[in-house]
């Protein structure tokens, strides 16, 4: 949602956290900032603090509750307001009505580690952390290896079409150091976005066996 | 019905102090902004500054900074204006009106019908 | 802090007929999150004030459809599409964008 030269972005991880970005132009004075939540058809509703990441953006996350639980659904609506303080009073600074699951953007793959490893050949697998069980099966994954001598924008992406919680990389040098990463993204969703990159898995081939092709 | 009733004229000498009160009604006390205007006989309205009562928290118009002094008593739902080292400029009537605490819309909604203060030795 | 100017200072206006105040700021009252909170309050003889329109053009619940409000950025209007009786008193801009908050000076309409 855009309020003039403000942006605010706001993203769902399916289960049980809203994360928000609020950026604006032209510098604010000292003044605490706070993202409320007000969804339409539940009890609850939610604060957090503002904090800066940047000279013009701050951002924080709503903690909805226990971070494997389902705290929201397709239907949900959440309308979500920056507020900062004036005087004694808060002003609406931007505001939004805010679709979930038309939102999403996973947290990072975790639990990344090396199968087997050959010369030529390294199996990985990871885990999806708080995905919801709505999504079943219908989740992609992108991949990428680090090379030695190169940097992880040069990576080659490879794309996974399905919920396939493993990799088989191939054509690998031996002996060499390499890293991985993985993300993870929900089909569903107009605006939904990759998840971060997992923390790279560092791994490293086996040396070729001398006059013997493994 | 909301309905903010402030208390009696006041009649004051130069130097001295006044203690305005407004008692508020028909809605939560707590939940919403109490500020104070003055009207100077004849003049303008004069924004003075204001409290939330679900706090305390005050703000204070810089012009009258160091000489006004807002509270409020949740027990009664009653907020105060105390202005001090009173001159005879201070003539005028104070009126306390309701705000939003979030200021979405519109700074006063429901205004207290006004005390007259008036300062003169 | 930002000044507020209306005009004119007195306007008689004939019962029925239209009535037009200006209030001018010193400054763009644009707030940083792109709303201009510019409000318009009706004060009766011997009454407190009570608040027309907010946010430039938006009448308060309650109040007649004859009252109507327009501008941005400096200049603002209230307009009265047919004056009546009841509409005598003195008409006040204020502006919430900027803290500290301001008055215009007051605009008194009267019965010619």
């Known amino acids: 949602a855009v309020n003039g030269t403000s942006q605010f972005t706001c993203f769902y991880n399916s289960r049980a956290n809203i994360s928000c970005v609020w950026s604006q132009d032209g510098a604010l004075q000292d003044t605490s900032c706070q993202v409320h939540a007000w969804p339409d058809r539940r009890r609850w509703n939610q604060t957090c603090e503002l904090l800066p990441v940047s000279q013009a953006s701050w951002a924080c996350n709503l903690i909805l509750g226990a971070p494997d639980s389902q705290k929201l659904t397709t239907v949900d609506i959440v309308t979500l307001r920056v507020l900062c303080r004036e005087g004694v009073r808060w002003r609406v600074m931007a505001i939004q009505d805010f679709k979930p699951f038309e939102n999403l953007r996973l947290m990072a793959p975790i639990s990344l580690q090396v199968v087997h490893v050959e010369t030529h050949r390294c199996n990985i697998s990871w885990e999806i952390s708080q995905a919801s069980h709505y999504f079943e099966r219908h989740l992609e994954f992108e991949a990428r290896t680090l090379s030695p001598g190169h940097t992880w924008e040069e990576a080659p992406l490879l794309t996974l079409k399905q919920k396939q919680e493993w990799i088989c990389l191939e054509t690998l040098t031996p002996d060499t150091q390499y890293e991985f990463q993985v993300r993870v993204k929900p089909l569903q969703g107009e605006f939904t976005t990759w998840s971060p990159w997992s923390q790279p898995l560092a791994f490293r081939t086996k040396p070729a066996a001398l006059g013997k092709d493994t | 019905e909301v309905q903010l009733v402030q208390s009696g004229a006041e009649v004051k000498k130069p130097g001295a102090s006044v203690k305005v009160s407004c008692k508020a009604s028909g809605y939560t006390f707590t939940d919403y902004v109490i500020s104070w205007v003055r009207q100077a006989t004849g003049q303008g309205l004069e924004w003075m500054g204001e409290i939330y009562p679900g706090d305390g928290n005050t703000y204070y118009n810089e012009m009258f900074k160091g000489r006004v002094t807002m509270t409020r008593d949740t027990s009664i739902s009653t907020a105060y204006m105390e202005l001090s080292s009173l001159r005879s400029e201070d003539t005028a009537v104070y009126y306390c009106?309701?705000?939003?605490?979030?200021?979405?819309?519109?700074?006063?909604?429901?205004w207290g019908q006004g005390t007259t203060v008036t300062v003169s030795s | 802090d930002v000044v507020m100017t209306q005009s004119p200072l007195s306007l008689p206006v004939t019962l029925g007929q239209p009535a037009s105040i200006s209030c001018r700021s010193s400054q763009n009252i644009v707030h940083s999150n792109a709303q201009t909170y510019l409000e318009w309050f009706q004060q009766r003889p011997g009454q407190s004030p009570r608040l027309l329109i907010y946010k430039v053009s938006n009448r308060f619940s309650g109040v007649p459809d004859r009252f109507s409000g327009s501008g941005s950025g400096t200049d603002f209007t209230l307009k009265i599409s047919r004056v009546e009786a009841e509409d005598v008193g003195v008409y006040y801009c204020f502006q919430g964008s900027h803290i500290p908050w301001t008055f215009g000076g007051g605009t008194k309409v009267e019965i010619k």
């Open positions: 009106a309701r705000g939003s605490y979030t200021y979405d819309n519109y700074a006063m909604d429901f």
